[in-house]
């Protein structure tokens, strides 16, 4: 995982401060306060892949 | 490296009691959820219990066979975590698993430690 | 409770050969966005490693022979082509509320 200032998350996760590496977007279900859940209301969600 | 170094265990009779302990190293503990997952032959992996976070006054959660017999604490400041059994039975026999999750998954687990409960 | 059906409950497969394995909810764990299902592999005498969160995204290091897909109430684990350290046993894991619960698991081995 990338440091800040480097390369992006990739698509459906976002950096946190907190833990120093990218963390999923789809755990800001059952942790919305997360550092990282601001990151990932700004992009759209990963597409399932069917 | 992440490292779930788990201790306790063993022998121990019918309404007993039994303290699991797992030291944590490698990640930022206090922002993890800690969780005891058993296996065994008769129910396969079963969770049964979790503790949260310090900023919520460590709510936990328990599966309904060990409520009120099991008890789940931590303390951050050494970053381990407790599992407290009371009141022991033969089917809670089996092999107990310290495990670490943010929220969802379960990315890592401790070597495992068995209880046996019999006389 | 949500319960999870694995299917097979074992498996045989030649070497090189495609593994599928099935995990069936009782309700559904997705949301429009994501699906909140995760699979382990276990070989005797260790815990259980975690290979694939979300149905379909895999854990860092794991090969790129497992994948995941699925949604709702049906999800799939696929390894292709199975190699020989693949013989274990492969759990699905649900996080859609508590108590999180797990299938009963897949015994893989080799022809």
């Known amino acids: 995982e990338q440091a800040p200032g480097t390369a992006p998350c990739s698509r459906g996760s976002s950096w946190s401060a907190d833990l120093d590496k990218c963390m999923d977007c789809a755990s800001c279900r059952a942790r919305p306060h997360a550092d990282f859940c601001l990151g990932c209301a700004a992009a759209p969600p990963a597409p399932f892949r069917l | 490296e992440v490292k779930l170094q788990q201790s306790g265990g063993g022998l121990v009779q019918p309404g007993g009691s039994m303290k699991l302990s797992c030291v944590a190293s490698g990640f930022t503990f206090s922002y993890y959820w800690m969780n005891w997952v058993r296996q065994s032959p008769e129910q396969g992996l079963e969770w049964i219990a979790e503790?949260?976070?310090?900023?919520?006054?460590?709510?936990?959660h328990y599966a309904e066979s060990v409520k009120g017999r099991f008890t789940i604490s931590r303390d951050d400041s050494k970053n381990s975590v407790y599992l407290q059994m009371n009141n022991l039975r033969p089917e809670d026999t089996g092999i107990y698993y310290c495990?670490?999750?943010?929220?969802?998954?379960?990315?890592?687990w401790g070597q495992g430690t068995t209880l046996t409960v019999s006389s | 409770d949500t319960v999870l059906t694995q299917s097979p409950a074992s498996l045989v497969v030649s070497l090189g050969q495609r593994a599928t394995i099935s995990c069936r909810a009782s309700q559904s764990v997705s949301t429009s966005d994501y699906s909140y299902i995760h699979w382990y592999q276990q070989k005797p005498g260790q815990p259980p490693k975690f290979l694939i969160k979300?149905?379909?995204n895999r854990d860092s290091g794991v090969p790129a022979r497992f994948s995941g897909s699925g949604s709702g109430t049906d999800f799939t684990l696929n390894i292709h082509p199975v190699e020989e350290d693949d013989t274990a046993i492969y759990y699905c894991?649900?996080?859609?509320?508590?108590?999180?619960?797990f299938g009963a698991g897949t015994k893989l081995e080799l022809q």
């Open positions: 979300y149905a379909s």
């Open positions: 503790i949260r976070l310090q900023s919520n006054d460590y709510p936990t």
């Open positions: 894991q649900h996080s859609w509320e508590i108590p999180p619960t």
């Open positions: 495990a670490c999750r943010y929220a969802d998954y379960f990315d890592h």
